[in-house]
Interface confidence: low
């Protein structure tokens, strides 16, 4: 039988009455245009909603926007458009919400053609009040907050100036001209690229990379011949043009650009690209595009310095620079990532890794599913997940895969079961163990969200017709109840719940359409009365993550340690609550060869855990570039995987000798770098 129709599915008692008492409708006094929603702070209940409506006039387009505020998680909204002087807000800049619980908000206004600069509205009290500020420049990008100090803002102007404010947008100073890209680093550092000969596009590959650590008082040039740069975890990356040709290479720094090392990655040509897929303080997943318009490349994983890379996955689907990749970090279980590969027959298949890119495998076929027409053998196939690429191809996939750090082990995604991703209408699948096993959860495409740290899953069917029904599950998607939240169906546009999945409120957004008008409407449903009591100790059970063989002493060991979690029993209908903290008990594992990656010049043959020397490097001295010096590497081929905590057991020896010679790198060596002050 279909999910949710089994005999053992118990119904949640009196849920209709409980939900009816906690369903709040708000009709917005707006013609339907576009709507954007932002949460201000964490656990504050404050939501800002900006609606915009364009009226095309004969010669120009007249815009009108309204701003609404809720402080009860969306149950009630107040029109606060007068706080921003009824000004039209530019939606392309969105609402710039400050980091953490700063309560800061910046809205960028539309200004008339002849004005000297732009205009912003600033709030530092969770949008209770706004201050209008006229800018000395026209912004090109949204205001960017420093992660360390929300009073510090940076923005680029339409004239390519880099502007900084130290008092939350009250006063602005242009600290540099001819800037292409600027980013905040750690400790209020700003990194930016500059051009010399006319424009960012014309100088691509000849840009300079600059750094300021004092908000523009002084600068240091930390790189030349730059194509682009990026920050990931504690790593600063720059792609740098080679001296002789049009290829470029990745250089990496872990000291904010003072010293650089050449990453042991293939160089790329003009039509190719590098992309940082994921990065943390331990390591980086890097995609290197294949030559030609293939739509795929190779994933490499780095060592702890971001210098030595191991090939992780071939034929990784990534269409173009800034294009689509299905690479997804499964945040509900450590070490798990999902992505797609383009196989030799040009079909697209989903792969999963449970050990941070060490090994990739197909997803196990859900037990309650049949293989589809993509399968050569009707009894042997895999689950294939729809993500960004499928969405970009306008397939019937309303949402990307979903996981939440505090809903341990839960992954929800659209998928198909066969030998490859199918163009057919997908179903929704759920994993409760971080991707090891899967079950069909819902028939057909749905929108879905996780509430109360996994205590409730909510879903709405994806339909072109108006809807008035919401589905919810209190047992991780095994059984489903349906609730009619309104008599009058609405054209559904989105589900909104507070980021972090701790809330018990869900907002259903849509519009009503009558003969003469259409209006935005939201229904906010509070599930607090469905989960009547707080969860107690008896409601939780011990779960060993990554467990595949309970007989094995090392069962659950991933990256050198195993973790036991306290997880809510599926049968318990209770509140984890807003203050719920994931309880986990780690224990260290003995080291095995699986805890080491292959060092520079070594690789792992398929289905072998030993690292062997690359044939072309056999008998050669292994020399590589480190911090602008040439190093001589004496190694037996292993280096500990970044973040691996294993102890004892196997311990391959490794030694690096400094050759005390300069690298032949076209990148600036530290001595050549220059500084200047304003």
């Amino acid at each position: 039988s279909a999910p949710g129709e089994d005999e053992e599915c118990g119904r949640v008692r009196d849920f209709v009455a409980k939900l009816a008492n906690n369903t709040h409708q708000h009709v917005f006094d707006d013609l339907r245009g576009s709507v954007s929603l932002s949460w201000v702070g964490d656990s504050t209940g404050v939501i800002l909603v900006l609606t915009t409506f364009h009226v095309p006039l004969v010669i120009m387009t007249f815009g009108q926007s309204k701003l609404y505020r809720s402080e009860d998680y969306g149950k009630n909204f107040k029109d606060i458009t007068d706080l921003i002087n009824n000004t039209f807000i530019r939606t392309e800049f969105g609402m710039a919400i400050g980091p953490e619980n700063s309560g800061k908000v910046v809205l960028t206004a539309e200004v008339s053609g002849g004005s000297r600069g732009g205009r912003i509205f600033r709030s530092s009290d969770f949008a209770k009040n706004f201050v209008q500020t006229d800018l000395p420049f026209h912004p090109l990008t949204q205001m960017m907050y420093s992660p360390q100090n929300s009073d510090y803002l940076l923005a680029l102007s339409t004239e390519n100036g880099l502007w900084v404010s130290k008092n939350f947008g009250g006063k602005w100073e242009e600290i540099h001209k001819a800037v292409c890209l600027a980013k905040w680093g750690s400790d209020n550092t700003i990194f930016f690229t500059t051009y010399a000969n006319g424009s960012c596009k014309a100088d691509l590959g000849a840009l300079e990379l600059w750094r300021t650590s004092d908000l523009g008082k002084s600068f240091k040039t930390i790189g030349v011949k730059i194509y682009s740069f990026g920050l990931g975890g504690r790593f600063l990356f720059a792609s740098v043009m080679a001296d002789k040709d049009t290829t470029r290479r990745i250089h990496v720094s872990t000291d904010q650009g003072d010293t650089w090392s050449m990453a042991q990655l293939p160089s790329v040509g003009q039509e190719q690209f590098y992309s940082i897929l994921a990065a943390n303080d331990d390591m980086v997943f890097m995609h290197v595009d294949e030559p030609g318009d293939t739509g795929f490349g190779t994933i490499f994983t780095s060592d702890d310095r971001g210098i030595v890379y191991s090939k992780s996955l071939d034929r990784h689907l990534y269409t173009t620079t800034g294009g689509e990749t299905d690479f997804t970090n499964v945040t509900s279980l450590r070490g798990v990532y999902i992505t797609s590969v383009l196989s030799e027959d040009n079909s697209i298949q989903t792969m999963i890794t449970f050990d941070q890119g060490g090994r990739w495998t197909h997803l196990r076929k859900p037990e309650n599913s049949e293989c589809d027409a993509t399968a050569k053998n009707k009894n042997e196939c895999s689950l294939h997940i729809h993500a960004s690429y499928s969405i970009s191809q306008k397939l019937n996939v309303p949402m990307a895969p979903l996981s939440e750090p505090n809903a341990v082990g839960i992954v929800i995604a659209h998928g198909s079961v066969g030998d490859a991703i199918s163009v057919m209408v997908p179903d929704v699948y759920i994993s409760d163990d971080g991707g090891y096993s899967w079950t069909k959860m819902l028939e057909g495409p749905h929108y879905y969200t996780i509430l109360d740290s996994g205590g409730i899953i909510v879903a709405i069917e994806h339909s072109s017709r108006p809807i008035n029904v919401i589905k919810f599950s209190t047992d991780e998607g095994q059984c489903w109840q349906t609730y009619t939240f309104t008599r009058d169906p609405i054209y559904f546009t989105g589900l909104a719940s507070e980021p972090g999945a701790r809330s018990m409120n869900i907002s259903i957004w849509g519009f009503t359409e009558s003969f003469l008008t259409s209006q935005w409407v939201s229904y906010t449903i509070d599930f607090k009365d469905i989960l009547e009591r707080n969860c107690e100790e008896k409601d939780y059970t011990i779960w060993l993550a990554h467990s595949t063989d309970p007989e094995d002493y090392e069962d659950g060991c991933i990256l050198g340690y195993k973790e036991q979690f306290l997880r809510l029993r599926k049968s318990s209908v209770c509140q984890n609550g807003r203050d719920y903290v994931v309880t986990k008990q780690p224990s260290i594992c003995l080291c095995s060869l699986e805890d080491f990656l292959c060092d520079f010049g070594y690789y792992r043959p398929e289905n072998d855990s030993k690292c062997v020397e690359q044939p072309e490097l056999k008998g050669h001295d292994l020399e590589f570039c480190l911090y602008g010096r040439e190093e001589h590497l004496t190694t037996n081929g292993y280096r500990k995987i970044p973040g691996d905590k294993c102890q004892g057991g196997v311990n391959p020896v490794r030694e690096v000798k400094d050759l005390k010679k300069k690298c032949t790198s076209n990148f600036l060596s530290p001595e050549k770098q220059n500084s200047k002050s304003n």
Epitope: D293, T294, G295, F296, L317, T319, G323, E324, L342, D345, N346, S347, I348, E370, C371, D372, A373, T374, A375, K376, K378, Y389, S390, Q393, K394, L395, D419, A420, I421, S422, V423, M424, V425
Partner: antibody, heavy 129, light 107 residues
Framework: QVQLVQSGAEVKKPGASVKVSCKAS????????MSWVRQAPGQGLEWMGI????????SYAQKFQGRVTMTRDTSTSTVYMELSSLRSEDTAVYYC??????????????????????WGQGTTVTVSS | EIVMTQSPATLSVSPGERATLSCRAS??????LAWYQQKPGQAPRLLIY???TRATGIPARFSGSGSGTEFTLTISSLQSEDFAVYYC?????????FGGGTKVEIK
């Protein structure tokens, strides 16, 4: 040999429904998707939708959404296309066509499209009061 | 949806001559394109798939080229049995769409 044999011509009144069948032979029915394409008199070809013969899941062109239903019977290797609420502009020849492209989602750039390689002989549906 | 435009609508060619048919897509369809031939009272027949690969049993005088948005079907030396209507079709994005057709007639 591989062939698709469709049901005979139909004459229907406006508002009625028509159900056209397409029987496959000479290949493994569950290995290929089936597309339906129609052609109004003197007009070009128009794709209606596609069906997956194993799961029976479908994907329809927006224009026919809500009016068309594609089903299959694996025991007889037959695919059906039902069009409801018929109007005079639905008068056309309806073709089923084997569509290997359904075997995988269109990949980027390098993916090859295999085309609808086997067609039924067509079924003429006339809608007239 | 992707709109496919064929030109010319009608092409008058003498037997033995070369015929060049064009097909343009409103956005890139990469190489996910097929060409079909249809004669009066018959079902369409697949000629070319993947923009340039001849289907089984199709004579070498038929060739396809192009990628992205511009495609061409070339018949190097027209035979009497080649006078028909030719359609291009994309399968890059659903729904699959056909061009309006080019009728190749005897001059």
């Amino acid at each position: 040999q591989v062939q698709l044999v469709q049901s005979g011509a139909e004459v229907k009144k406006p508002g009625a429904s028509v159900k056209v069948s397409c029987k496959a032979s000479g290949y493994t029915f569950t290995k290929y998707y089936m597309s339906w394409v129609r052609q109004a008199p003197g007009q070009g070809l128009e794709w209606m939708g596609i069906i997956n013969p194993i799961g029976g899941s479908t994907s329809y062109a927006q224009k026919f959404q809500g009016r068309v239903t594609m089903t299959r019977d694996t025991s007889t290797s037959t695919v059906y296309m039902e069009l409801s609420s018929l109007r005079s502009e639905d008068t056309a020849v309806y073709y089923c066509a084997r569509d290997p492209s359904g075997i995988a989602l269109a990949g980027p750039a390098s993916r090859s499209y295999y085309g609808m390689d086997v067609w039924g002989q067509g079924t003429t549906v006339t809608v007239s009061s | 949806e992707i709109v496919m435009t064929q030109s010319p609508a009608t092409l008058s060619v003498s037997p033995g001559e070369r015929a060049t048919l064009s097909c343009r897509a409103s956005q890139s369809v990469s190489s996910n394109l097929a060409w079909y031939q249809q004669k009066p009272g018959q079902a369409p027949r697949l000629l070319i798939y993947g923009a340039s690969t001849r289907a089984t049993g199709i004579p070498a005088r038929f060739s396809g080229s192009g990628s992205g948005t511009e495609f061409t079907l070339t018949i190097s030396s027209l035979q009497s049995e080649d006078f028909a209507v030719y359609y291009c079709q994309q399968a890059r994005l659903g729904p699959w769409t056909f061009g309006g057709g080019t009728k190749v007639e005897i001059k």
